[in-house]
Each structure stands twice: as structure tokens, then as C-alpha cells.
């Protein structure tokens, strides 16, 4: 082990202060107790160090605190925390929501780095299920982050958080995703009347079997294009002209716009072209007039 | 006086390695940062990347990772930048520069790299 | 990445001119960010460190100030011998980044 440089009279740190922005690398690390930085880690966000001046003040925490910092440091961190590895995050035991949000914010405005989701890892697993208050902080200040999560992590929220969920947080959500989420979003908004349950329900009807797509056509909802072109293919199929009609209102007309795209595509070559020719758009492909259709999965299902 | 004293001009060809050395006196490096940066004939410069020689810890631009490997020999006080593949877009001059942490208040006098066949 | 941007590619002056030379990063970087001087066929020096600190033996006809993402480095009564090009550098995160130079000619 090298002999560390001195420090020389005088210039031991008495608090964290301004004026330790001009210590140089070897006067930090000889000068500054790791104790008395652990302690007042809060005036550190106000004082102006440079990166290197922080790789400083890191080492020395770790050399304090070599199984992981205590959430007592972790909470005043502040820019601090861009220096973490997400191996340094990994020894971490991270409770307050207070916390989270603190470091979240240090990190606002740029893309989560592995830093940030290995954060939002270790506090999700232990809180044990992603709370509301948890899920209305992670998607603040990250509208994907419920995307980003796996079918499996997505069956942990309960359906009390999806009242926090915003459209956007959904955009970037495949629909494997939203198989899981929009039973927990039809739970959530269950009580609600007609109109109002259908603006908070649409983000999440890609993942909506045909039995719900098939009551929704009752209700006069109006659904644009966009939402109808994100359905399941699968969902949609089974659905009447009658009834996709009834489920699009006046929006229907956008079929003829997406009619090469799925599923439109695909649901039009399910449907008879006599009853495809009643929308009066001019859509082709449907099944000829006296063609007979055998529905073959029924068949196979009986015997 | 403090000095960053750095290896001669090289003439190197294309595909080839070439390891560039900067002897620093008057300090020790292990209290310090050592960085290394890279200016081509009529450009800006460029920040390569940089060691903290007492943790051996080195950190570089993305664009340079790579292409570069620091490293620095405490023993000797003499700070490295290994060049790998190299191609006509390296040719250029190499300055070492240290920091106490703050800004690089010392600078070597560069290494001319000249890249051709 | 941060990005460090001199606007002013050449600025033209007279001996005994103030000029002022701009520098804007492209997020907060506080007060890390350090100017450099290199004069023709020379290796850089420093001249201000954490935006406004002189480096020793530079003389007080340069100035730097600002903090934040606005920066600028003044030299009053500008000499000949300050013909060089003049560089901005944040030092607040990594990857380190350099503005694109700005060469100061003298009438």
C-alpha cells in the first residue's frame, strides 16, 4: 500500500463547503473525513464539484461503506448518484419513496440509464408489488417504464395503481403487455358509466378479447381508427360488420384508409362481401356471395 | 516546475498498434487525474479519455473505446495511450494533460501520429 | 453527451479591443467548465478554471464568467501576442467535451 499524501496544516475539513471545490484530487482524498461527508452528504448537491472531484468523494464512501451505503446517504446523494455503477446499486437497501424520488430527480430529463432501472429494480422487489404511489412517481418521471416492464413484472400491479397510468404511459407497450394489464385496467374502472369508462379503458383495449370489443359496440363509443388498428387480430375477427359499425360510429369511414393494413385486412377477408358492400366504402376481399364459410377451429374443438 | 514530457513523433502503418508514453516530473500521478486528447491538422480537440492512476480507473469517450486503452505506470510516474487498428482518421497530435480535479493545468507537448503506407 | 458549443468560429479585434468569446453547454454543467489558450504550433494552456478562476500567471486582462449552460471568456485590452484559438471545456460529466474553437485575429 502507498503512503498517502499528508494533509497539510490547516486544511482539514471542518464541514462540506464551497471553498472544498478548489481542493485538489490529493487534498480531498487526505482532508476530507468519510464520516464527516457521510453526515452531511446533503450540502454536497449545493456545492459546484466537478466529476473527477466526485469520483473523489465516491471512493471514499465506499471505502466507509463496502457492503453498500445506508438509505440515510443514499437519500442526500443528489449528483452523486451519477457516479454509481449499478453493481454499487445492486448492495443497496432502498425503502422510502422519498428516496427514490430524490434520485429519480437528479437523473430528470435524460433516457433511464441501467443506473435508474437497477434503482427501480431493487425498490420495486422490495416493496414487493408496484404500489400506486410507486407507479404515479416511476411514471413521472418515465411515461415508458410500465412498457419496459415484463409480462411477469406486470402482473405485481395491482389494479388500484392503474389509476395512475396516462395514455402515453402505454404507447411503447407490446401487446403481450397489455394481455396482462388491461384485465387489472377493466377491474380498476369497473364502476364507472359508459362514456367514462370507455376514455379511461381505450388505452389498454389492446389487450381486449372479442367478448369485450363485441359489448363495447352497444354502448355508442365512437372508437377512432388508431385505437381500432391496435386491437388483437385475433379480437377483432370474430366481429360482425353490424357490430364493427356500431364500435367505430362515425369513424368507420377510416377502414377504407387502412384496409391493406391488419387486422382491418385480416377482418375483411373474414367477412361476407355482401355485408362488407352495406358500409358503402368500397372494400374488397370479403368472402364471395353463396361461398359457405366452415368455421374449423370448432370443428377441431368438438372432436 | 512541473512537467509532462512526451514520446517523439511516430510514422506508423495503416492496421498497426503504436503506444505513446508521457513522463510526468515534479509530481506524483497517483495525486492526480492523467488525461489524453487528440487534436487533428486544423481541428478542435478532442477528449480521449482519461486514468485515476491511485485506483487504476480508466474512463473514456464512447467514440474512442475502442480504439484506445490508458494506463498508467505509478512506479515510473509515466502515463500510456495504446492506439489499436489504426487508419488515416488517427493521424493527428496527442497531448497528455493533468488534473488535480478541477481543469488540466499542465499539458504535455504532443506527440505528432502520422497513420500512412 | 454533453455538447459545448462556440458559436464564433473567428472574431476579428484591434490591440487595446475588449472581445468577448461565448461558450454554451447543452445542459447544466454548473461552474465546470475550463477555457484554454493555443497559440500557433503550441500545446494548449489554461487560462480560467471553474468558470471564472484564474490559472497562475495568466494575466488579468482575462476574464471568465457564467455558470449554468452560458459561458464566456473576455479578454480587455487585447494584445498581439493573444492571437491564438480559444477553447471551452466542461469538466462536469463524462464523456469530457470541448467546444469547437474560436481563433481570435488581430487587425
Known amino acids: 500500500e502507498v503512503e498517502k499524501t499528508a494533509c497539510p496544516s490547516g486544511k482539514k475539513a471542518r464541514e462540506i463547503d464551497e471553498s472544498l471545490i478548489f481542493y485538489k484530487k490529493w487534498e480531498l482524498e487526505a482532508c476530507v473525513d468519510a464520516a464527516l461527508l457521510a453526515t452531511q452528504m446533503d450540502r454536497v448537491n449545493a456545492i459546484p464539484f466537478t466529476y473527477e472531484q466526485l469520483d473523489v468523494l465516491k471512493h471514499k464512501l465506499d471505502e466507509l461503506y463496502p457492503q453498500g451505503y445506508p438509505e440515510s446517504v443514499i437519500q442526500h446523494l443528489g449528483y452523486l448518484f451519477l457516479k454509481m455503477s449499478p453493481e454499487d446499486i445492486r448492495k443497496w437497501n432502498v425503502t422510502s419513496l422519498e428516496t427514490l424520488k430524490a434520485l429519480l430527480e437528479v437523473n430528470k430529463g435524460h433516457e433511464m440509464s441501467p443506473q435508474v432501472a437497477t434503482l427501480i429494480d431493487r425498490f420495486v422487489k422490495g416493496r414487493g408489488q408496484l404500489d400506486k404511489d410507486t407507479l404515479d412517481t416511476l411514471t413521472a418521471f418515465y411515461p415508458g417504464y410500465l412498457c419496459s416492464l415484463s409480462p411477469e413484472e406486470l402482473s405485481s400491479v395491482p389494479p388500484s395503481s392503474i389509476w395512475a397510468v396516462r395514455p402515453q404511459d402505454l404507447d411503447t407497450c407490446d401487446p403481450r403487455q397489455l394481455d396482462v394489464l388491461y384485465p387489472k385496467a377493466r377491474l380498476a374502472f369497473q364502476n364507472m358509466n359508459g362514456s367514462e369508462y370507455f376514455v379511461k379503458i381505450q388505452s389498454f383495449l389492446g389487450g381486449a378479447p372479442t367478448e369485450d370489443l363485441k359489448a363495447l359496440s352497444q354502448q355508442n363509443v365512437s372508437m377512432d381508427l388508431a385505437t381500432f388498428m391496435k386491437l388483437r387480430t385475433d379480437a377483432v375477427l370474430p366481429l360482425t360488420v353490424a357490430e364493427v359499425q356500431k364500435l367505430l360510429g362515425p369513424h368507420v369511414e377510416g377502414l377504407k384508409a387502412e384496409e391493406r393494413h391488419r387486422p382491418v385486412r385480416d377482418w375483411i377477408l373474414r367477412q361476407r362481401q355482401d355485408d362488407l358492400d352495406t358500409l358503402g366504402l368500397g372494400l374488397q376481399g370479403g368472402i364471395p356471395n353463396g361461398y359457405l364459410v366452415l368455421d374449423l377451429s370448432m370443428q377441431e374443438a368438438l372432436s | 516546475e512541473v512537467q509532462l514530457q512526451q514520446s517523439g513523433a511516430d510514422l506508423v502503418k495503416p492496421g498497426a498498434s503504436v503506444k505513446l508514453s508521457c513522463i510526468v516530473s515534479a509530481f506524483n500521478i497517483e495525486d492526480t487525474y492523467m488525461h489524453w486528447v487528440k487534436q487533428r491538422p486544423e481541428q478542435g480537440l478532442e477528449w480521449i479519455g482519461s486514468i485515476d492512476p491511485a485506483h487504476d480507473n480508466a474512463k473514456y469517450d464512447p467514440k474512442f473505446q475502442v480504439k484506445a486503452t490508458i494506463t498508467a505506470d505509478t512506479s515510473s510516474n509515466t502515463a500510456y495511450l495504446q492506439l489499436s487498428s489504426l487508419t488515416s482518421e488517427d493521424t493527428a497530435v496527442y497531448y497528455c494533460?493533468?488534473?488535480?480535479?478541477?481543469?488540466?493545468?499542465?499539458w504535455g507537448q504532443g506527440t505528432t501520429l502520422t497513420v500512412s503506407s | 453527451d454533453i455538447v459545448m458549443t462556440q458559436s464564433q468560429k473567428f472574431m476579428s479585434t484591434s490591440v487595446g479591443d475588449r472581445v468577448s468569446i461565448t461558450c454554451k453547454a447543452s445542459?447544466?454543467?454548473?461552474?465546470?467548465v475550463a477555457w484554454y489558450q493555443q497559440k500557433p504550433g503550441q500545446s494548449p494552456k489554461a487560462l480560467i478554471y471553474?468558470?471564472?478562476n484564474r490559472h497562475t500567471g495568466v494575466p488579468d486582462r482575462f476574464t471568465g464568467s457564467g455558470s449554468g449552460t452560458d459561458f464566456t471568456l473576455t479578454i480587455s485590452n487585447v494584445q498581439s501576442e493573444d492571437l491564438a484559438d480559444y477553447f471551452c471545456?466542461?469538466?462536469?460529466?463524462?464523456?469530457?467535451?470541448v467546444g469547437g474553437g474560436t481563433k481570435l485575429e488581430i487587425k
Open positions: 445542459q447544466n454543467v454548473r461552474s465546470a
Open positions: 494533460a493533468k488534473s488535480d480535479g478541477f481543469y488540466f493545468d499542465s
Open positions: 471553474l468558470a471564472s
Open positions: 471545456l466542461q469538466h462536469w460529466n463524462y464523456p469530457l467535451s
